[in-house]
Interface confidence: low
């Protein structure tokens, strides 16, 4: 049986080496000579030769200083053999424990720790945690028992001890009220970690604490009074720009301004926020009415996008807005008026009344009417009432002034405001047709060849509208039928064919042609016919003396 006492060896031992650790014994040494050897880590496996044993005495020795932080325990096996080399014992496991010395100082896990805390945070608020490690034995010794302390705080304002650190955990917390980002946005702490519960080896690191913004500053108007003016009736007009300052972090919800008009009951105004500089832009939400109110005294409050974190007074500004008078033009109702009237409407009679209204219901200004455009000079207007009458006969067939049976006149209404304002209305007279035009032939001048004359087509034209037009009736009168014949060229009788009954002499002839429309309105038209010295289809030939009733008359 083996006799092996517990083995421990301090690290970092001074020499001389080798140094006895313990004597190993086998009780078989009573029976004969026993020889000892060791195997295992530190003996015959790396690190080889750290431990040796005296072969005959069994003294286990260490040959060099140990480093617990490298190898904290060694496991060896002791062997005992007789002089003939036979084992007298089974191998025995030997555990060598390296005992710790405080040979390592704490090491922070980072050189610089970063943390943040909201301004105004109450004492006890956790900010961040710093961590250090120590390679020494923290189980059996205090060599790795780290204690944390704050060595310095920069700035030391508003108090030199704004933060505290938990000695054991390294958690940094707020210990004093008064954190204010706007005054001191960052703090730099030098923190220390020391072993032996703070009494031993030490090291330092830096903790940088950023104080984050809360909405603890209100936006403040500067100045608090403003003046502006705006013309009446115009919406979305910028009146003035409101200026605010806010000490909170720019371009954050705690800085961004929200403007509220406290006494805009009719929703006449709106304030929007300029996202770049936080200005308030006061505009009209709808057109203002000078006649109703010439001056507004607006009270505008400003807050932030997010609520105030603390009890703060809301800043207000006073804006005096003067409304400028604009004389509004009268408005014709409707802007375009259509009136149907017969083209034979009596001269001097009233056709219609066309009036305009003042845009402001309550301002009863006097309106005067006049005709601005009446190209045919057919109309006149009562300047006070807007009653429109004819001053001349209307004519639907006046194609210079009437388009598609419609005569367009422009009427203007002028008020007695200052300055005078004028509105325009369009009067459309839809002229209904009367049968005041008889049919006429087209063309009226016709050429025939003396030899083999080609019949000529004559169109019948009537400026009126159906039913005062086709079918037409044609008839040769005053003896013209002696030398000429006509026949209808189409079923609607809107054209006829004229041809001579016999060979005619070269010369000019006059033919009387009576044309009658569907309503029996007729008219006799003289056709001028030239017989030319030619054959077939005629061109234009020289003029000769006219011939009445289709007969040549001597000069």
């Amino acid at each position: 049986d083996w006799v092996i006492p517990p083995i421990s060896c301090p690290e970092n031992e001074k020499g001389p080496f080798p140094k006895n650790l313990v004597q190993i014994k086998s009780n078989k040494d009573k029976e004969g000579k026993v020889f000892y050897s060791i195997t295992g880590q530190g003996a015959d496996t790396p690190p080889v030769g750290v431990f040796i044993i005296e072969r005959e005495t069994g003294w286990l020795k260490v040959t060099e200083p140990l480093d617990r932080e490298r190898i904290a325990t060694y496991t060896l096996f002791s062997h005992a053999v007789s002089s003939n080399g036979n084992a007298v014992e089974d191998p025995m496991e030997i555990l060598i424990t390296v005992t710790d010395q405080n040979d390592n100082k704490p090491e922070f896990t980072q050189e610089v720790f970063k943390g943040s805390v909201m301004e105004g945070a109450l004492p006890g608020t956790s900010v961040m945690e710093v961590t250090a490690t120590d390679a020494d034995d923290d189980v059996n010794t205090y060599n790795a028992a780290i204690a944390y302390t704050i060595l310095s705080q920069d700035p030391e304002l508003p108090d030199k001890n704004m933060f505290t650190i938990n000695r054991n955990t390294g958690v940094i917390s707020v210990v004093t009220t008064g954190l204010d980002r706007e005054s001191f946005p960052t703090y730099t702490l030098v923190v220390q970690a020391a072993d032996l519960q703070g009494e031993g080896l030490s090291t330092t690191a830096t903790a940088v604490i950023t104080v984050t913004d809360t909405n603890d500053n209100p936006p403040i108007f500067n100045p608090t009074t403003y003046k502006g003016q705006v013309p009446e009736n115009e919406a979305n007009v910028v009146i003035t720009t409101l200026k605010v300052t806010d000490a909170d972090a720019p371009n954050t919800p705690a800085w961004e301004a929200v403007y509220t008009i406290l006494n805009d009951d009719g929703g006449q105004f709106v304030v929007t926020t300029n996202p770049v500089n936080n200005d308030g832009i006061l505009k009209t939400a709808k057109g203002l009415d000078f006649e109703a109110k010439q001056q507004y005294i607006l009270h505008v409050a400003v807050t932030n996008v997010v609520p105030f974190e603390v009890s703060l007074t809301t800043s207000t500004a006073t804006v005096t807005v003067d409304v400028l008078d604009v004389n509004e033009a009268p408005i014709f109702v409707p802007p375009e008026k259509r009136v149907e009237v017969s083209e034979d409407f009596g001269v001097g009679q009233e056709i219609t009344s066309y009036t305009a209204q003042e845009p402001d219901t309550f301002m009863e200004q006097k309106i005067t009417y006049r005709i601005w455009r009446d190209t045919a000079n057919w109309l006149e207007i009562n300047p006070d009432t807007g009653a429109i009458s004819t001053r001349a006969e209307l004519d639907r067939e006046d194609f210079e002034h009437v388009k598609n049976s419609t005569y367009t006149a422009l009427i203007i209404a002028t008020d007695n405001g200052s300055p005078v304002a004028t509105g325009t209305g369009t009067l459309l007279l839809i002229l209904s047709d009367v049968n005041d035009n008889a049919p006429i032939p087209e063309p009226r001048t016709i050429f025939f060849c003396e030899r083999n004359p080609k019949p000529q087509v004559i169109n019948i034209i009537d400026a009126d509208l159906p039913p005062n037009t086709s079918p037409f009736t044609a008839e040769l009168t005053h003896g013209a039928s002696a030398n000429w014949t006509i026949q209808y060229n189409d079923p609607t009788q809107e054209s006829i064919i004229l041809k001579p009954k016999m060979a005619l002499e070269v010369g000019d002839y006059k033919i009387n042609l009576k044309l009658m429309d569907n309503q029996n309105k007729d008219q006799v038209t003289t056709l001028e016919v030239s017989v030319c010295d030619c054959e077939g289809a005629a061109g234009v030939c020289r003029k000769a003396q006219p011939v009445e009733a289709g007969l040549q008359i001597p000069a």
Epitope: D265, G266, A292, K293, Q295, I297
Partner: antibody, heavy 116, light 107 residues
Framework: EVQLQQSGPELLKPGASVKISCKAS????????MHWVKQSHGKSLEWIGN????????GYNQKFKTKATLTVDNSSSTAYMELRSLTSEDSAVYYC?????????WGQGTLVTVSA | DIVMTQSQKFMSTSVGDRVSVTCKAS??????VAWYQQKPGQSPKALIY???YRYSVVPDRFTGSGSGTDFTLPISNVQSEGLADYFC?????????FGGGTKLEIK
Amino acid sequence: EVQLQQSGPELLKPGASVKISCKASGYTFTDYNMHWVKQSHGKSLEWIGNIYPYNGGTGYNQKFKTKATLTVDNSSSTAYMELRSLTSEDSAVYYCAIGNYWFAFWGQGTLVTVSA
Amino acid sequence: DIVMTQSQKFMSTSVGDRVSVTCKASQNVAINVAWYQQKPGQSPKALIYSASYRYSVVPDRFTGSGSGTDFTLPISNVQSEGLADYFCLQYINYPYTFGGGTKLEIK
């Protein structure tokens, strides 16, 4: 021609409610605020509140906030004022009047009498 | 609330005379004041708005003046139909408030 036609006189018992009407014509109903004004016998005028028919927005005199409720029916161009929990103090002539701020036209008035 | 004070409850005048009805505001109301005439048994009628602007169809015997806190309604060439109550109104801020009224009597 602008006209405001108010409903007829009312005789009511204490604790009752009444809804008086004001029918407008001759202008665009939604363009102007409709105001309501109280005139007690032999006394001055008191502004009750107004309603903007365009969006139904209202403004009240705090004194009448729990007494009066203003509504409109744009389809019939009619404004209404309901008075509740009537007492003898509510006996008065009530006028409707239009104008976005000052009152250009007034109704003929509705006499409300509260008597046990 | 803004208080509108018409210090004279009654005023007596003769036909053809000139008389001035006054109204004082408890704080600055700029020119946001209107004047109304109320004849016995009738609704009030607008005379003046924005302190000095005569309302349509109102005779030019009625004028208005003032701004800030002091306002006057001068009536010249008083006629017998001028027998009425005259009220001022401020409309700068809610609640709108009327003066207590001035009764004009014809001698």
